[in-house]
């Protein structure tokens, strides 16, 4: 093809020419190209009008092209270009007019390009610029040059992993001249030693990220004090898991936060065994979102009912016990992957709509009722990857639930009553791998709106699937894999008119029967892989529903003998439905073991006796 | 298939091969070398990714003396405010990082362990790299 050796991803639009040892811009790519990836080619030098042949370009990726020189007007014809990526080029010479002509540029990525200063970076005319990423460079001064006043659309400025040590009042002077309240600024991984008090006074930012910046607690304390007067929608403070500098620290390090106006606050990876930190929390009582990630915190009983937090996130923290959580305004609580508190104790969160308590190894003495959470507004509940959860109430007061996930927790008392009877609004239910043994046909009664049911990795009395889905008239997805099933009721699926995907894989079925699927007019995917299917269990195999598009019978134990000829022929007739048909192999007899079923030519004659 | 040696410890010998077509060079150092009976140390990685690292996860396929364990998915980077600094690494950017590790050992039976690490990243998801680690557990220390 004319564009080779490049790869045509979308004809006439997107071409990938990555790592093809090109020394120059290819000339066999269509004029109409909008996305062009030339990364990892040794282009080394971009002269004027280098891309004259691609006037429609919108995205140009020049990552790691060993570019050392960019001349005036190198991109001059690219008036539609919105994204220019220059990551990893050892640029030594950048002409003043290098970026001229880029009248629509919105994203400029100059990461790891040997950039030593913003002052000499010739981008002042790029008025449409929304995102400037100059991370991983050699920038020492945080002085935002005068030309920034032209960049009135700038929303993201990434200066992370540079060499900035000091921030002075004059550095941010230009931000006072422009109404950039939407600017997100990332200064992470700069070795900041000093922020002049007042430098951020009356400056508004959308997001400020300061992670792994300080190698000393006193420096951190004075720098946070230096942020006084800043109004920021989201403040992210702390360290990275693989870039740890600070020793165990005390709450005084964060006292300066009281002098900021913050809407959302996130603290990550700090080894502070925070104990009585009520002063800190009181400073942040009015934020709408409060997040602690990987912070060692003994107890959070100091959270006040009156805090205005609407979203609280506690992830990978250590607690002495499950915290007392009583918060009037909270709408979302994410409490995941924490250590310490092994038993859930009820919370009082009257406004709560979203609750994720996954991956804590928690045990629940009872579940579930509005009294456990203090709310009747809950729509999303994730209790997955916990310990023993004893089902003692059928979700009284929690009738608004739409999403419920118990996977990989150990559910007790699931077959004693209709646990989900109240949940007429539930759309998604996952009880996979919950040690549930279905011994009660009413287990799913009440789930009138359910669309997705995942129950893989459980078991059934006598390994038989009874008629337990009668209420699930809206079900579209059902996963019954790894349930040790051997047989199923012929009417098990009779009410599932909307079912589209049925996973019966990894069970112990020895024969295939089409009869149970006759009432599934919407079925598109049926997976019977990894069973022990040898044959069909009746001579007259009917057709699957006409809607069926994918049938997976791989990794079964097909008996490729004359007595099963009609079944093997029936399989061949279903060829257009079969998924990975080449993995359907004979198991018996031994001389045919491993042979693909579809390539068999079984000619059988009746022996006359 | 060329084997790249990583290290030897008192109870293990570790090497890897590439299990993808690309075989983009990746440098891995472990100091001190992992002991299966339990150890802590530093894993140093030098790598130039061929796609953005954001939303990185590993698919782990572990084989113990020819017995394959179920696939395990380990999410490393979720996409914003991530745990690791390398989660923000872009295609073509040098990743030169050190990650501390520690684990309490369990009693491993002697033999050969294989661990295929499929690194998937980006949006749309594509393979970043694939490495197959061979860990020979020395019988003397079990």
């Amino acid at each position: 093809e004319s564009w080779e050796p490049c790869v045509e991803v979308v004809p006439n639009i997107t071409y990938q020419c990555m790592e093809l040892k090109f020394y120059k811009i290819p000339d066999n790519i269509p004029f109409s190209t909008k996305n062009l990836d030339l990364s990892f080619n040794p282009l080394r030098h971009l002269g004027s009008y280098s891309f004259l042949r691609f006037p429609e370009l919108q995205v140009l990726d020049l990552s790691r092209c060993e570019i050392q020189t960019i001349e005036d007007g190198a991109y001059q014809s690219l008036s539609h270009l919105s994204t220019l990526i220059l990551t990893g080029n050892p640029i030594q010479s950048l002409a003043l007019g290098a970026f001229s002509g880029l009248s629509s540029l919105q994203k400029l990525v100059a990461v790891e390009t040997n950039l030593a200063s913003l002052e000499n970076f010739p981008i002042g005319h790029l008025k449409t610029l929304k995102e400037l990423n100059v991370a991983h460079n050699l920038i020492q001064s945080f002085k935002l040059p005068e030309y920034f006043s032209n960049l009135t659309n700038l929303e993201h400025l990434d200066l992370s992993s540079n060499k900035i040590q000091n921030i002075y009042c004059k550095d941010l002077q230009v931000l006072h001249q422009m109404p950039l309240s939407n600017l997100s600024l990332d200064l992470s991984l700069n070795p900041i030693n000093f922020i002049q008090p007042g430098a951020f006074k009356e400056i508004r930012l959308h997001k400020l990220t300061l992670r792994s910046n300080f190698d000393d607690l006193n420096v951190m304390k004075t720098c946070i004090q230096g942020l006084a007067g800043l109004e920021v929608h989201r403040l992210v403070l702390g360290e990275f898991r693989n870039e740890r500098n600070l020793e165990e620290f005390d709450k005084s390090s964060l006292e300066g936060l009281c002098n900021l106006t913050i809407e959302e606050f996130r603290l990550t990876y700090l080894d502070c065994y925070l104990d009585n930190i009520i002063d800190l929390f009181n400073c942040l009582a009015n934020v709408s979102s409060f997040s602690l990630v990987s912070v060692n915190i003994k107890r959070v009983e100091d959270f006040s009912y009156n805090f205005r937090w609407q979203h609280l996130e506690l992830v990978n923290c250590k607690f002495e016990q499950f915290p007392t959580l009583e918060l009037k305004s909270l709408k979302r609580l994410t409490f995941t992957a924490n250590k310490g508190g092994n038993a859930f104790s009820e919370v009082d969160l009257p406004s709560l709509e979203f609750l994720d308590l996954s991956r804590n190894g928690l045990s629940f003495k009872g579940c579930c009722s509005q009294s456990d959470f203090g709310t009747t507004s809950l729509k999303y509940l994730d209790l997955s990857f916990n310990d023993v959860i004893t089902m003692s109430s059928n979700f009284l007061g929690l009738e608004q639930l739409e999403h419920l996930d118990f996977q990989h927790s150990n559910l007790k008392q699931m077959s004693q009553f209709s646990v989900f009877l109240s949940l007429r609004n539930l759309i998604y239910l996952d009880i996979s791998h919950t040690h549930t043994r279905v011994a009660f046909n009413g287990i799913f009664d009440g789930l009138l709106s359910l669309k997705v049911l995942k129950m893989a990795g459980n078991s059934f009395q006598e390994n038989f699937l009874p008629d337990i889905f009668t209420d699930l008239k809206n079900l579209t997805f059902l996963d019954l894999s790894q349930c040790q099933l051997e047989q199923l009721s012929p009417t098990a699926f009779d009410t599932l008119n909307k079912l589209q995907v049925l996973n019966m894989s990894h069970n112990n079925f020895f024969s295939l029967d089409t009869f149970p699927y006759k009432c599934l007019p919407s079925l598109q995917v049926l997976d019977y892989s990894l069973n022990h299917i040898m044959t069909s269990n009746n001579q007259e195999l009917q057709h699957f529903p006409s809607s069926l598009a994918f049938l997976n019978l791989t990794q079964n134990d097909f008996a490729c003998t004359c007595e099963h000829q009609s079944f093997l022929q029936w399989i061949k007739d279903q060829r257009q439905l079969l998924v990975e048909a080449e993995r359907m192999e004979c198991a018996t007899p031994s001389d045919k073991q491993g042979m693909p079923v579809l390539s068999l030519n079984i000619t059988c004659q009746m022996n006359k006796t | 298939q060329k084997h790249y040696w990583v290290c030897n410890s008192s109870d293990a010998s570790i090497s890897y091969t590439y299990c993808d077509k690309m075989q983009y060079p990746i440098s891995i150092n472990v100091n001190p070398c992992i002991k299966l009976k339990g150890s802590r140390g530093l894993l140093h990685i030098f790598y130039i990714p061929r796609r953005d690292v954001k939303q990185l996860y590993f698919n782990l396929y572990i084989t113990v003396n020819s017995m394959t364990l179920p696939k395990r998915k380990e999410v490393i980077c979720r996409g914003s405010d991530d745990d690791y600094s390398f989660c923000r690494a872009l295609k073509g950017e040098t990743v030169n990082t050190t990650v501390s590790f520690s684990f309490k050992g369990i009693k491993f039976s002697k033999g050969k362990y294989k661990c295929v690490v499929e690194a998937i990243s980006g949006s749309p998801e594509e393979m970043l790299f694939c490495l197959e680690f061979d860990i020979i557990h020395q019988p003397n220390s079990n």
């Epitope: 009820e346 579940c367 009722s369 | -």
Partner: antibody
């Protein structure tokens, strides 16, 4: 509307076991919440004794742990208190109450006086 | 266990006067403190939860404040029907405990 009603003997001999029952109407005791016993000696303050959770789990005040039992009869929607080896200091008005999700008590029975005397 | 100390034990007040009752906790309990009113021969009635949140149906003259260890219940303009004993209760941790009570009588 949730209502609680205590019942049981008003007089118990020293060293005997005090037994009280709380009948609940308007809410199932297995449907949610925890169900508590609180007592008040004549002319004195309130003392929390213990509870039974809707799941059947129980917990008690450490000061009474060796003598107290709380159980329930779900078919009658009631829960009971047993306090063994009583003495005169156990003379009190005994209240049953329902605790809210926050650790407070919006619903109380009217109380029943139990006198320990020979 | 957390000890709650109420003061005064007794208060004699004329109608329309302002009444202030304090409750001090032996350790910080944030705002996990609740107030009850108990009239003679009646069971206690929840008035205020979480230090300052009035229960619906409770007259607006009742208010609460405080956080940490020091809390106050205020009756702004005492009425005859307010003659009762008032108890504070901490909900910070088990065992749940009550203050000793403050008896308010009308002069």
């Amino acid at each position: 509307q949730v209502q609680l009603q205590e019942s049981g003997p008003g007089l118990v001999k020293p060293s005997d076991t005090l037994s009280l029952t709380c009948a609940v109407s308007g809410y199932s005791i297995t449907g949610g919440y925890s169900w508590h016993w609180i007592r008040q000696p004549p002319g004195k303050g309130l003392e929390w004794m213990g509870y039974i959770h809707y799941s059947g789990y129980t917990d008690f005040n450490p000061s009474l742990k060796t003598r107290i039992t709380i159980s329930r009869d779900t078919s009658k929607n009631q829960f009971s208190l047993k306090l063994s080896s009583v003495t005169a200091v156990d003379t009190a008005v005994y209240y049953c109450a329902r605790k809210d999700s926050g650790k407070n008590f919006p619903y109380w029975g009217q109380g029943t006086l139990v006198t320990v005397s020979s | 266990e957390i000890v709650l100390t109420q003061s005064p034990d007794f208060q004699s007040v004329t109608p329309k006067e302002k009444v202030t009752i304090t409750c001090r906790a032996s350790q910080s309990i944030s705002d996990h403190l609740h107030w009850y009113q108990q009239k003679p021969d009646q069971s206690p009635k929840l008035l205020i939860k979480y230090a300052s949140h009035a229960i619906s149906g409770v007259p607006s003259r009742f208010s609460g404040s405080g956080s940490g260890t020091d809390f106050t219940l205020t009756i702004n303009s005492l009425e005859a029907e307010d003659a009762a004993t008032y108890y504070c209760q901490q909900g910070h941790s088990f065992p749940l405990t009550f203050g000793g009570g403050t008896k308010v009588e009308i002069k």
